[in-house]
């Protein structure tokens, strides 16, 4: 019986460990600054790193600019978006800016896109200052199904800060769906 | 066999509970306002509470102004930093401010410091208003190794809001490293 | 013995699954815009959705405008609050605004209310721009006891953005109390 108990314990430990890791997908994606679209309109950001520096992904997929859910669950989603402008980059098109982020969910089965979270601010970036900066942070807890896709839209993409510590988004699974 | 099963269940329950608690380090550190440096562009904040009010720590260490990781894992890190100024405190050095936070990771083995997250804003705090306030929030999911240290740097430390609900940072372990 | 092992495994799998789900309460509550109080003073927001759109709740209770904890534990709490004004809504009472959020905890046993987190900004929303927007995000890790209540207070409630992706708060349990 002792051997059997050890076997039970062993298999359980193995199963618990394995299921724990399998049950916890995550991603932290950082902006790929080599391919930021220009303009001041609202655009979807499709170029993100998933495997360099702080960027990483596990049990989720990054494809076509979207973070794809592989495992049903409740996830905490977050995004940090930084905008900046220095006078040496040239004049702004307007001093009155709307700096925004939208975290959206797309369901392939029912082709539709919905905004989960938004944040931002209107700003007056006057010529009296040589440098301007502004960051947005959003986060929330959402039910995600396998196959659903998360993407990031921003206004004024040409003003994005390209640093990996500045502009990123991510997700981690917290629990299963009942 | 029933007794054996009960023993298996009991030991397992005990093990599961114990390992679950051991596997989840956390910290929530609040600013110690008795020792805020004055100053400049970017200073490291070294005085934080870890055991009073909302501040708490478990399976992590706070030493020399840094939050030290004791257990490898993926952690969610966050910081909330509030700046404020009332005209009764005296005049500002400049009305054009850069209010920033940097969450940094230092590896002792390879002496180097890297910024994990940054946030903030340039602000125009004019004399037309007697009171000014601004808060920054950042958060993200990072792989941390035992011995690595997390610290907070800010601009304009003399403008920090000293309340425990205003200026704090923290971390909690979400999952093991594969 | 094999049957016994299967029974042990089965009961364990069941117990593990059940305890895991039971151990992880959560809530994501979105603003109910049909009942936002007016005014510019600091008010408690009592109308939130818990079961439509992105709003959901499990193993927690929403009652009388407060999120009630049913299970002791350490929780990650968060809030995202958006304010906006368009000139078509009429003139602002003042162009100098203090846009703030306070996440508070109330203990029924010891009738007292404490602010866990605060965030926001003073803003100058001048008439030179037809539209103004600003979002606040706060988050932190707190020990909550069964029966304690979480509520949201804001300044300038009449300026709140009523969208479910804009103004919300939530919580999820991360771990048990030792």
């Amino acid at each position: 019986i002792r051997a059997e108990k050890a076997m039970v314990d062993g298999s359980w430990l193995d199963l618990a460990k394995r299921s724990k890791l399998e049950a916890q997908p995550f991603a932290h994606l950082t902006i790929n600054a080599t391919d930021i679209p220009s303009g001041s309109h609202k655009v979807s950001l499709s170029s993100w790193y998933h495997d360099r520096g702080w960027a990483k992904i596990s049990n989720m997929t990054f494809s076509n600019g979207k973070l794809i859910v592989n495992q049903d669950g409740f996830y905490y989603l977050y995004a940090n978006i930084c905008f900046r402008h220095h006078e040496t980059s040239g004049d702004l098109a307007t001093e009155y800016l709307q700096l925004m982020v939208y975290v959206t969910k797309t369901s392939i089965k029912i082709p539709s896109s919905h905004t989960l979270m938004k944040g931002g601010s209107t700003k007056y970036w006057s010529g009296n200052s040589e440098f301007h900066f502004y960051s947005i942070n959003v986060g929330g807890f959402f039910k995600l199904r396998s196959g659903e896709e998360i993407s990031i839209e921003v206004s004024n993409p040409s003003l994005l800060d390209p640093d990996q510590d500045a502009t990123y988004f991510g997700a981690f699974k917290v629990r299963d769906i009942d | 066999i029933r007794a054996e099963k009960a023993m298996v269940d009991g030991s397992w329950l005990d093990l599961a509970k114990r390992s679950k608690l051991e596997a989840q380090p956390f910290a929530h550190l609040t600013i110690n306002a008795t020792d805020i440096p004055s100053g400049s562009h970017k200073v490291s904040l070294s005085s934080w509470y870890h055991d009073r009010g909302w501040a708490k720590i478990s399976n992590m260490t706070f030493s020399n102004g840094k939050l030290i990781v004791n257990q490898d894992g993926f952690y969610y890190l966050y910081a909330n930093i509030c700046f404020r100024h009332h005209e009764t405190s005296g005049d500002l050095a400049t009305e054009y401010l850069q209010l920033m936070v940097y969450v940094t990771k230092t590896s002792i083995k390879i002496p180097s410091s890297h910024t994990l997250m940054k946030g903030g804003s340039t602000k125009y705090w004019s004399g037309n208003s007697e009171f000014h306030f601004y808060s920054i929030n950042v958060g993200g999911f990072f792989k941390l190794r035992s011995g690595e240290e997390i610290s907070i740097e800010v601009s304009n430390p003399s403008l920090l809001d000293p309340d425990q609900d205003a200026t704090y940072f923290g971390a909690f372990k979400v999952r093991d490293i594969d | 013995i094999r049957a016994e092992k299967a029974m042990v495994d089965g009961s364990w799998l069941d117990l593990a699954k059940r305890s895991k789900l039971e151990a992880q309460p959560f809530a994501h509550l979105t603003i109910n815009a049909t009942d936002i109080p007016s005014g510019s003073h600091k008010v408690s927001l009592s109308s939130w959705y818990h079961d439509r759109g992105w709003a959901k709740i499990s193993n927690m209770t929403f009652s009388n405008g407060k999120l009630i904890v049913n299970q002791d534990g350490f929780y990650y709490l968060y809030a995202n609050i958006c304010f906006r004004h368009h000139e078509t809504s009429g003139d602002l009472a003042t162009e100098y605004l203090q846009l703030m959020v306070y996440v508070t905890k109330t203990s029924i046993k010891i009738p007292s209310s404490h602010t866990l987190m605060k965030g926001g900004s003073t803003k100058y929303w001048s008439g030179n721009s037809e539209f103004h927007f600003y979002s606040i995000n706060v988050g932190g890790f707190f020990k909550l006891r069964s029966g304690e209540e979480i509520s949201i207070e804001v300044s300038n409630p009449s300026l709140l953005d009523p969208d479910q992706d804009a103004t919300y708060f939530g919580a999820f349990k991360v771990r048990d109390i030792d």
């Epitope: 200052s129 | 050095a93 054009y96 | -």
Partner: nanobody, 128 residues
């Protein structure tokens, strides 16, 4: 690189007035800067006199200068001034202007370490 050039020093009698100038160059604007005046008398330590926030025009003075000295700036010309009235023999010193990025409160700019750039100085002598 910021350059600072002082002018306006000289020999005056007790009770006279003098206006020092400090011309700043090397940047298109100084809106985020604090400009300060320091002085050093022979055989003495360098001493803070006054500081001005370039953006707001608010000033901060050493006690002995309050009511007698006034600092101002012309943001269009990038010049700072120190108007000194009712001069005393103890005001004799080399007066230097300094510039530093503005952080925190203006009252913190009594410390020389807060300034990144310094002028060469101009001599002020008050004879009795």
């Amino acid at each position: 690189e910021v350059q600072l050039v002082e002018s306006g020093g000289g020999l005056v009698q007790v009770g006279d007035s003098l206006r020092l100038s400090c011309e700043a160059s090397g940047r298109s604007r100084f809106s985020t800067y604090v400009m300060g005046w320091f002085r050093q008398a022979p055989g003495k330590e360098r001493e803070f006199v006054a500081a001005i926030s370039w953006s707001s025009g608010n000033a901060y003075y050493i006690d002995s200068a309050k009511g007698r000295f006034a600092t101002s700036r012309d943001t269009a010309k990038n010049i700072m001034y120190l108007q000194m009235n009712s001069l005393k023999p103890e005001d004799t010193a080399v007066y230097s202007c300094a510039a530093g990025r503005g952080y925190g409160l203006l009252s913190e700019y009594t410390q020389a370490a807060r300034y990144d750039y310094w002028g060469q100085g101009t001599q002020v002598t008050v004879s009795s």
